[in-house]
């Protein structure tokens, strides 16, 4: 389960975002980010940082469709 | 060609300091994380610190944690690593490394230098 | 932190042998595990990542295994230049932790 608010690196950050995002799918860095192909966006922010949920859901591909 | 130097290393005593420098050179630098590894004579690998490709971030292993600061500077293509309070122990060979990208979503060190011997005794 | 344990710590084999050297790690890592090779006096170099991935330029008798918490790296047939030390480590979470290592040695 995700805990908000850590540092988050390496396969332990694949596995939170495949968790938080589920089947919408994920990114490294945002599209609409002027942000080189190769920079590492979240890892920057999550493994060197911390970051929370909210942060997390910002890489998920698309938005999650509401009931 | 692609490829890291290490340099800086030398004996110094107990509690002195060092600089630690690693020059690259073949590829683009500024898109890659970048990691010094140290090797204790006759021992083991040991991951001792990271740095973010834009420099934002750092990572340090509890050993050094305090005493160890890494930085790097882009436009010259050279990754630091300034070391004190410098103790017997963090005698070693201090190997920079080249992250993976995140083409794959996998990590390894894909690129080291051929290291630098920092041998700390009075 | 994920401790990674290799065994055995020193291996002799002959060449055109076949070797496997396994490392297992404290916690499910699922395949983020890498392989290198160390030489007396040469810096490591990357042999295998992802668990069972070639790194380009490896020789194909190289080839590793495994998921979860155990993991094997296999020669299948080794040549005088792959006598060296292996290194096993996980890249699942940090701090990025190494195996003890692997002495291969010639018999």
């Known amino acids: 389960a995700y805990r908000p608010s850590e540092t988050l690196c390496g396969g332990e950050l694949v596995d939170t975002l495949q968790f938080v995002c589920g089947d919408r799918g994920f990114y490294f860095s945002r599209p609409a980010s002027r942000v080189s192909r190769r920079s590492r966006g979240i890892v920057e922010e999550c493994c060197f940082r911390s970051c929370d949920l909210a942060l997390l859901e910002t890489y998920c591909a698309t938005p999650a469709k509401s009931e | 060609e692609v490829q890291l130097l290490e340099s800086g290393g030398g004996l110094v005593q107990p509690g002195g300091s060092l600089r630690l420098s690693c020059a690259a050179s073949g590829f683009t630098f500024s898109v890659y994380d970048m990691n010094w590894v140290r090797q204790a004579p006759g021992k083991g690998l040991e991951w001792v610190s990271s740095i973010s490709s834009s420099g934002g971030g750092t990572l340090y292993a509890d050993s050094v944690k305090g005493r160890f600061t890494i930085s790097r500077d882009n436009s010259k293509n050279t990754l630091y690593l300034q070391m004190n309070s410098l103790r017997a122990e963090d005698t070693a060979v201090y190997y920079c490394a080249r992250d993976s990208d995140t083409s794959s979503y996998y990590w390894y060190y894909d690129l080291w230098g051929r290291g630098t011997l920092v041998t700390v005794s009075s | 932190d994920i401790q990674m344990t290799q065994s055995p710590s020193s291996l002799s084999a002959s060449v055109g042998d076949r070797v496997t050297i396994t490392c297992q790690a404290s916690?499910?890592?699922?395949?983020?595990l890498n392989w290198y090779q160390q030489k007396p006096g040469k810096a490591p170099k990357l042999l295998i990542y992802a668990a069972s991935r070639l790194q380009s330029g490896v020789p194909s008798r190289f080839s590793g295994g495994g998921s979860g918490t155990d993991f094997s790296l296999t020669i299948s047939s080794l040549q005088a230049e792959d006598f060296a030390t292996y290194y096993c480590?996980?890249?699942?979470?940090?701090?990025?932790?190494f195996g003890q290592g692997t002495n291969l040695e010639i018999k």
């Open positions: 480590q996980q890249s699942y979470s940090f701090p990025r932790t």
């Open positions: 916690h499910d890592i699922s395949n983020y």
